[in-house]
């Protein structure tokens, strides 16, 4: 007797009978920028304060008939999904609604900007606890809307938005494309991406995670006790806003970066059928469905990391792609990927006082992606050690020589166009795990970090025969920080982290032939923080 | 997610500040840019968000908006300042003819201008 969507986001230990997490979210205020709402609906009565903010365009069409229940439909449903008494995620959360969408569900970028400004001013006038802003809307890519979201996020506000219902790359829409915003795609009861008529949920690297978004039962503005099913990425975003409210209520000091990492960490992994997405988007789209944490406390001891993909570099010879971590995150490793296999590797470099991950395209290549591994590592001091190309046949190597620094990632970058095509593989000397090894014609970059209690180890998985994909995973209690391929395998397309697994992709084996170059080795660097574990135990 | 120089239509109007003898001409070498929605049906021409450089104060935003109105009036154009932004981004929202974009891009403190566009419930 519990709606499927609430069951789906609820960890098994909560599911004894009903949806029974505590009435969470009571310390959090959720702002909803949407249509008008029916605030006296039983689901949300007394929980939603309708602000006097309204900035909407006129409805299209001369014969448009403004019917209150239709005007309120979208916003009322979403308010119910976030905090409804019976069908809401965060039943204790209080909400404030701003009207930025008209009775046809249409608004403007400028109206949304003024709404975001209103929230910021309200926050300054009357600071409260944690704020979550739900933006269940989308327009074309907008530099100014993304910039406003960035400013609000940097003021400590958590913004959650719909990925969009256009069955398209979410990076082409705003605010979905704003890096500081938590962007949510929609899945159904079968954990499949939601189809909406001829379209469906957006996808791609700008999506952070998915959440239930089809046949979601929620408050209907038709009557004060009515319910209705609605579908869309707005409904999915509302689930994540509710989960965020629950998490922030349990841990009000969480930063946006910490919250995002936890949302990713507690999500159900690898349950979405990726065949629904266009082939070129599958690797970029996170296979994550949002869920509540199994308990409201005690996640602090883990080392949290996520994978951030850059935009595509484009095909020009000197094209590069840059992946960046959020301000509160540390870049612990950098890798690259090219579908054609023509790339010149990647390097970590400083930009504006922060490390970024830059990948380099090669002549004749169709373009590259840079892939950053972004982690939460308090009191970390990280630096990059570089070894230029070596003359010796043993290849290039670099290690972390500073006392107390450990290796978290390896990158290699080369100037020659086709590195290693006719050269034998370079093997890592045994017993030297704290160093990066690369081709003699490549520069090798080691990410070396010092943080209290940080320990890391290298894990390899090699396959002698050619294979399109080789993986190596970190075991329970360890977090993947670095992912790379052992040099010498010319047909490697690149390496990237998926959750706690390092994936090395190779060209189609049918074109490679099974020479000695068929051998592919995936190298994972797995880390954990004893300091975080101890701090967590002391809290408990 | 998307970089600021992202995948959308950008019209860069590189303009010399030669007319009007601006007292506070843009710093040498910086060019204000114009952006509009890549999806044509979603565009709302005639309304523009003028975004000013990061450290611009409210008083400067208001002064820049008034200057735009004055210069537009001298050319026979009516403009209406719909909102002055402060708190998140410095700037203002203006209803004006697209013919005035070149003029607006030359104003002091202007970082970029974006044509308004539609957003939709999802």
């Amino acid at each position: 007797s519990i709606p499927w969507n609430l069951e789906r986001i609820t960890p098994p230990r909560y599911r004894a009978d009903e949806y029974q997490p505590p009435d969470g979210g009571s310390l959090v205020e959720v702002y909803l920028l949407d249509t008008s709402i029916q605030s006296d609906h039983r689901e949300i009565e007394g929980r939603v304060m309708v602000t006097d903010f309204e900035n909407v365009p006129e409805e299209d069409g001369t014969r448009f008939h403004r019917q209150a229940s239709k005007c309120d439909s979208h916003g009322t449903h979403l308010a119910g999904v976030v905090s409804g008494r019976d069908a809401g995620v965060a039943k204790g959360a209080s909400m404030r609604s701003l009207r930025v969408l008209n009775c046809q569900g249409k608004g403007t970028v400028s109206g949304t900007l003024i709404g975001l400004e209103f929230i910021r001013k309200s926050q300054l006038v009357q600071p409260v606890g944690p704020l979550v802003v739900l933006l269940p809307l989308a327009g074309g890519y907008s530099r100014v809307l993304n910039a406003a979201c960035q400013r609000l996020a940097r003021a400590g506000v958590v913004l959650v938005t719909a990925a969009g219902n256009f069955r398209d790359d979410a990076c082409l829409y705003s605010p979905a494309s704003a890096p500081e915003v938590i962007t949510v795609g929609a899945t159904n009861a079968q954990d499949q991406p939601v189809t909406l008529g001829t379209l469906g949920t957006n996808f791609g690297r700008c999506v952070d995670l998915f959440a239930p978004g089809e046949d979601i039962i929620g408050a209907s503005s038709d009557c004060s006790t009515c319910f209705v099913s609605q579908s869309g990425t707005s409904q999915a975003a509302a689930h994540v806003a509710g989960i965020a409210a629950m998490m922030l209520s349990a841990e009000p000091e969480l930063t946006l970066a910490e919250l995002r990492q936890r949302l990713i960490h507690f999500s159900a992994k690898d349950v979405i059928n990726e065949a629904w997405f266009p082939e070129d988007q599958r690797v970029l789209t996170p296979n994550l469905v949002a869920a509540l944490p199994p308990s409201t406390h005690g996640a602090g001891w883990q080392l949290f990391c996520r994978t951030v993909w850059s935009a595509h570099s484009g095909p020009t010879r000197m094209a590069t792609a840059v992946a960046r971590c959020a301000p509160d995150e540390e870049l612990l490793s950098c890798s690259s990927f090219s579908r054609s296999g023509k790339r010149r590797g990647e390097r970590m470099e400083a930009q504006g006082g922060k490390l970024v991950c830059r990948a380099h395209n090669a002549f004749g290549g169709e373009g590259v992606y840079a892939i950053a591994r972004c982690c939460l590592l308090p009191q970390a001091n990280c630096s990059v050690h570089t070894a230029p190309p070596a003359e010796a046949s043993m290849g290039t190597r670099v290690h972390c020589h500073q006392q107390g620094h450990v290796l978290t990632g390896c990158s290699s970058h080369w100037e020659v166009e086709d590195l290693g095509t006719h050269k034998p593989p370079v093997l890592r000397p045994r017993g030297q795990p704290n160093q990066c090894v690369g081709h003699r014609e490549a520069s090798i970059h080691a990410s070396c970090c010092h943080a209290p209690g940080l320990e890391c180890k290298v894990k390899e998985h090699g396959i002698p025969a050619p294979q399109e994909q080789v993986t190596v995973a970190c075991e329970e209690g360890w977090t993947l920080t670095g992912c790379s391929a052992l040099p010498g395998t010319s047909h490697v397309l690149g390496a990237y982290a998926v959750d706690n697994t390092c994936v090395v992709r190779s060209r189609d084996v049918s074109t490679t032939g099974s020479t000695s170059e068929g051998a592919v080795t995936a190298v994972a660097i797995c880390c954990r923080s004893r300091h975080l574990a101890q701090a967590s135990q002391e809290l408990q | 997610q998307e970089d600021e120089d992202g995948d959308y239509e950008e019209l860069v109007l590189a303009l010399r500040s030669e007319e009007d003898g601006l007292a506070e001409a843009p710093e040498h070498g910086t060019t204000a840019t114009f952006h509009r929605c890549a999806k044509d049906p979603w565009r709302l021409p005639g309304t523009y968000v003028v975004v000013l450089k990061e450290e611009t104060h409210l008083s400067q935003s208001e002064r820049t908006a008034r200057r735009l109105q004055a210069q537009a009036a001298r050319r026979g154009y009516l403009t209406k300042i719909l909102h002055v932004f402060h708190g998140l981004l410095p700037g203002f929202l203006v209803k004006m003819s697209g013919d005035l974009l070149e003029l607006a891009l030359k104003l002091p403190h202007v970082d970029y201008i974006e044509e308004d566009s539609s957003v939709f419930a999802q």
Epitope: D40, R85, K91, I217, C223, T225 | -
Partner: antibody
Framework: QLQLQESGPGLVKPSETLSLTCTVS??????????WAWIRQPPGKGLEWIGS???????YYNPSLKSRVTISVDTSKNQFSLKLSSVTAADTAVYYC??????????????????WGQGTLVTVSS | EIVLTQSPATLSLSPGERATLSCRAS??????LAWYQQKPGQAPRLLIY???NRATGIPARFSGSGSGTDFTLTISSLEPEDFAVYYC????????FGGGTKVEIK
């Protein structure tokens, strides 16, 4: 089948608090599919909804009575209760408890008051 | 608040006759209207919900119609046990009841 039974004092003094309990049998009060309501009927007059509660203790009240009403639930006893403060003679009525489908689970039945208890008369008099 | 006005206040009919009861809302309640039957000393019983749906166990002689502001309860052929008071109730905006129509034996 589900049955509801009201209980409580039949006489309450003006300005005091009226307290009634409804005991549910033949089904569990602890289901997310239902709300549990109080409705009253002054002698010879029509019906007036007072307020409702769900198994989590989430309430909503008739706006005209909200300031004086408290409804609570005890799932362990399969009971829910009504308290109406500062009563006057105008509060003299037959008080009914009833089940109301929450509407969240459409299969649970129509979203109306059904079934009802047989009612209990409460007189406010000194 | 939505006010429901029932008419007539009393309807005097004989068994076997057709009874038509009216309920008018002060504003649209869409189809969110129910009809209840109450006999002396008993609790009300749900007859019709969502304007036209018969509740479980209700005989086919009871039917409901209407939407918006005007609703009708029809008893096609009155049985002796049908003489009672009938109330309409809306849930478009909270819950309000009509003043009732008494169907009495002529």
């Amino acid at each position: 089948q589900l049955q509801l039974q009201e209980s409580g004092p039949g006489l309450v003094k003006p300005s005091e608090t009226l307290s009634l309990t409804c005991t549910v049998s033949g089904g569990s009060i602890g289901s997310s599919s239902y709300y549990w309501a109080w409705i009253r009927q002054p002698p010879g007059k029509g019906l007036e909804w007072i307020g409702s509660i769900n198994y989590r203790g989430s309430t909503y009240y008739n706006p005209s009575l909200k300031s004086r009403v408290t409804i609570s639930v005890d799932t362990s006893k399969n009971q829910f209760s009504l308290k109406l403060s500062s009563v006057t003679a105008a509060d003299t009525a037959v008080y009914y408890c009833a089940r109301e489908n929450s509407g969240v689970v459409p299969a649970a039945g129509p979203n109306w008051f059904d079934p009802w208890g047989q009612g209990t008369l409460v007189t406010v008099s000194s | 608040e939505i006010v429901l006005t029932q008419s007539p206040a009393t309807l005097s009919l004989s068994p076997g006759e057709r009874a038509t009861l009216s309920c008018r809302a002060s504003q649209s309640v869409s189809s969110y209207l129910a009809w209840y039957q109450q006999k002396p000393g008993q609790a009300p019983r749900l007859l019709i919900y969502d304007a036209s749906n018969r509740a479980t166990g209700i005989p086919a002689r009871f039917s409901g119609s209407g939407s918006g502001t005007d609703f009708t309860l029809t008893i096609s052929s009155l049985e002796p046990e049908d003489f009672a008071v009938y109330y309409c109730q809306q849930r478009r905006n909270w819950f309000t009841f009509g003043g009732g129509t008494k169907v009495e034996i002529k």
